[in-house]
């Protein structure tokens, strides 16, 4: 921001009324009036160019310093070209000297040169040559000097003429202030510019109404330079929740809008499924039946729990069931849907039911499922199972009601045994199998059926209560098809896969475990 100038002395604006002191009295400097642009203008002028040894002084009135530390002196003046006088005026000069003196009181007409300190020699950039003078073209020069730090109550300026033809049209003395400033929602007070060029006065700012320093942020500060300019802004203020920045102020959010945190962002319109907010709202309440999860941003619409999974099927495969379902028709407005599968088993004879989570196995953990299918295995034969698939989202925990669909399935067969070849020889095959432990109590015997590959007319059957059997009297180097099936009180269980096992050839050495 531009510096503010506080004027202490303005000769041009005073209309010749200041009555400055001239020394020696009645010689040298003289107050004159002229006409420029049809307006009267006053000037202090001297033009003793034909006589040598000029020492003419013009002293201002005493100027009260006030709060100024460094003053700026702006001079507007004209100097005639020494060559514009007949014979060149050998003693003529084209410069004058600027002085100042500090004092705590006004000395009146008591003028003492020795009290004055020279500021500078003032030289014109442009001199008024004969043709300019004749044509009334005033070649106005502007020079500025500064003095500081000042410490006394007031000061004088003085102008020493040493034989020039000069007119002072304007003498303006001022000091600079950094003006009151609103920046980054912080108010900085009007501050007097310091006196030393390298130094910058640090000024603390105050947040405007309804603005605060953001958490972890720096307090607003600016630096007031010597020239009255604000520099190096540090920190900032931001509008508090419920308020937004409008130009240099924080304005309450309009009804139907909200802002939930200290930030630079504007107020946002209340999202879907919220009630109309009042002025200055920090949030928008959800409509009845709609909710906001703790982690949901305030800008997100309010949502509700999903409806039940749309379509659920349970396909039995022996002692396994594959559950498949489709997503809910109403997601509740959310994308974080997960599914939970629970299992209940009932004994047909007694009608007694109970949870079966501990006795079954799921293809993946049954809670927090994101996919829409799961396989349940280790089911007991001749048991009724009911599976419940519940759809949940981020706000389901905020209501007591649940959204689920159920499917029931009856398991009539044991799971097919898993068969392994334990060993073989030229005339025998040793076979073992296994079924899930929960089903083993239901098995009465295991039936092993085998036949030569390619012979569809005859087969052999062996029954056993154990989990292995050795099939002997077999032909060497021959492939046999082997299947194992559990027998229960209610009938046959599911048969295993048909396995192909081959006996060893006569050249083979002894039995070989596989």
């Amino acid at each position: 921001a531009q510096g503010k100038e506080v004027v202490l002395l303005d000769f041009a604006a005073a209309g010749g009324e200041l009555g400055w002191l001239t020394h020696p009295y009645g010689k040298g400097w003289d107050l004159m009036q002229n006409i420029m642009n049809d307006m009267p203008i006053y000037m202090y002028s001297v033009c003793n160019v034909m006589s040598g040894d000029q020492d003419n002084w013009l002293r201002t009135n005493w100027v009260y310093r006030g709060e100024a530390e460094r003053i700026f002196i702006e001079l507007k003046f004209t100097v005639r070209d020494c060559n514009s006088f007949p014979g060149g005026a050998s003693s003529c000069k084209e410069t004058f000297n600027l002085y100042y003196a500090e004092s705590d009181l006004d000395y009146g007409t008591n003028f003492q040169k020795r009290l004055f300190t020279k500021i500078d020699t003032i030289a014109p950039d442009e001199i008024t040559v004969s043709s300019d003078f004749e044509a009334r073209h005033v070649k106005l020069n502007v020079e500025e000097r500064s003095v500081g730090p000042l410490t006394r109550k007031g000061f004088y300026l003085a102008f020493q003429d040493i034989g020039a033809c000069v007119a002072l049209l304007s003498v303006r003395v001022y000091y600079k202030k950094c003006p009151e400033l609103l920046q980054s929602l912080a108010r900085f007070p009007e501050t007097i510019a310091g006196s030393d060029a390298p130094s910058l006065a640090t000024v603390a700012g105050t947040c405007v109404d309804h603005a605060v320093v953001p958490p972890g942020g720096e307090e607003p500060r600016m630096h007031c330079a010597v020239d009255g300019e604000w520099l190096v802004p540090i920190g900032q203020c931001l509008c508090q929740a419920g308020y937004e920045k409008v130009e240099d102020a924080c304005q309450a959010c309009s009804p139907g809008f909200f802002k939930f945190e200290v930030s630079e962002s504007p107020c946002l319109e209340c999202p879907e499924h919220t009630l109309p907010s009042p002025e200055g709202a920090t949030s928008c309440e959800c409509e009845e039946g709609f909710f906001r999860a703790p982690q949901d941003p305030m800008s997100m619409p309010c949502t509700r729990p999903p409806s039940a999974p749309h379509y659920l099927t349970a396909v039995g495969m022996g002692a396994k069931v594959e559950l498949r379902w489709t997503p809910p028709q109403d997601s509740g407005g959310r994308e974080d849907i997960v599914y939970s599968v629970t299992c209940e088993q009932c004994w047909p004879e007694s009608g007694e039911c109970g949870p079966c989570e501990s006795s079954v196995r799921y293809s993946e953990p049954p809670h927090g499922l994101t996919r829409t299918s799961v396989t349940v295995s280790d089911l007991e034969p001749h048991m009724n199972y009911t599976f419940t698939v519940e759809a949940r989202n981020g706000v389901s925990g905020l209501v007591t009601s649940r959204s689920f669909r159920t499917a029931s399935v009856s398991i009539n067969q044991t799971e097919p045994p898993k068969v392994r070849l334990e060993g073989r020889s030229t005339t025998s095959l040793s076979v073992s199998w296994s079924i899930p432990p929960p089903q083993q109590s239901r098995v009465w015997k295991y039936e092993v059926t085998y036949r030569k590959k390619g012979d569809s007319n005859s087969y052999n059957v062996r029954r056993t209560e154990g989990f292995s059997v050795t099939l002997d009297d077999l032909a060497p180097d021959t492939t046999y098809l082997v299947q194992v099936q559990a027998l229960t009180q209610e009938g046959q269980g599911a048969g295993s896969k048909v396995h192909e096992f081959q006996t060893l050839s006569p050249e083979g050495s002894g039995s070989l475990a596989v």
Epitope: V46, V79, S130
Partner: antibody, heavy 128, light 107 residues
């Protein structure tokens, strides 16, 4: 020595025209502002017109504006006053006058000039 | 236009007298004032410019003073050659105006 010599005056009828000349010598004519000043018989002095050192600007008294024209020829060191539509009240001795700002020991010139050097004058009589 | 009024319009004085002629401007003219001397049948001669500055070759018995609207020409010790008509002229405005003149006669 500075010398200004006017000529061209005489008797002229109202509405008539006359051209006055002023021959300058003894100074650098092209440095001087030149003017015409008149004096009616038994009356005081009245400024008529002025011209700058190089031919401009020119100024006129309200009483002659639009009728009189001032001009100069620096190569001939001569000043002129062309007078048209002459009236009885234009009857006067017409003086040629000059001003050299170099002799004016002042930092800023006044808006107008005073007259350092004068000719002896030429009489213009407007009568029927 | 700025009007210039001289007083008196005529005066009688003896050789050696101190004579003062005044000139009043209708508005402030600072020190932009000149004084001329004119003898019958002759051209005017410049005496004083810028209210108080003596023109080259003018005797020092002539002096001028004043500023603003009130000005005076003083002849300290009137000489026989000084009996003439004296005119003031303002050059603060482009219409350079003269006073009506003051005639100094022998008593």
């Amino acid at each position: 020595e500075v010398q200004l010599l006017e000529s061209g005056g005489g008797l002229v009828q109202p509405g008539g025209s006359l051209r006055l000349s002023c021959a300058a010598s003894g100074f650098t004519f092209s440095h001087y502002m030149m003017a015409w000043v008149r004096q009616a018989p038994g009356k005081g002095l009245e400024w008529v017109s002025r011209i700058g050192p190089s031919g401009g600007p020119t100024h006129y008294a309200d009483s002659v504006k639009g009728r009189f024209t001032i001009s100069r020829d620096n190569s001939k060191n001569t000043l002129y006053l062309q007078m048209n539509s002459l009236r009885a009240e234009d009857t006067a001795v017409y003086y040629c006058a000059g001003y050299d700002s170099g002799y004016d020991y002042v930092a800023v010139a006044g808006p107008a000039e005073y007259f350092q050097h004068w000719g002896q004058g030429t009489l213009v009589t407007v009568s029927s | 236009d700025i009007q210039m009024t001289q007083s008196p319009s005529s005066l009688s004085a003896s050789v050696g007298d101190r004579v003062t002629i005044t000139c009043r401007a209708s508005q402030s003219i600072s020190t932009w004032l000149a004084w001329y001397q004119q003898k019958p049948g002759k051209a005017p001669k410049l005496l004083i410019y810028k209210a108080s500055n003596l023109h080259t070759g003018v005797p020092s018995r002539f002096s001028g003073s004043g500023s603003g609207t009130e000005f005076s020409l003083t002849i300290s010790g009137l000489q026989p050659d000084d009996f003439a008509t004296y005119y003031c002229q303002q050059y603060n405005a482009y219409s350079r105006t003269f006073g009506q003149g003051t005639k100094v006669e022998i008593k």
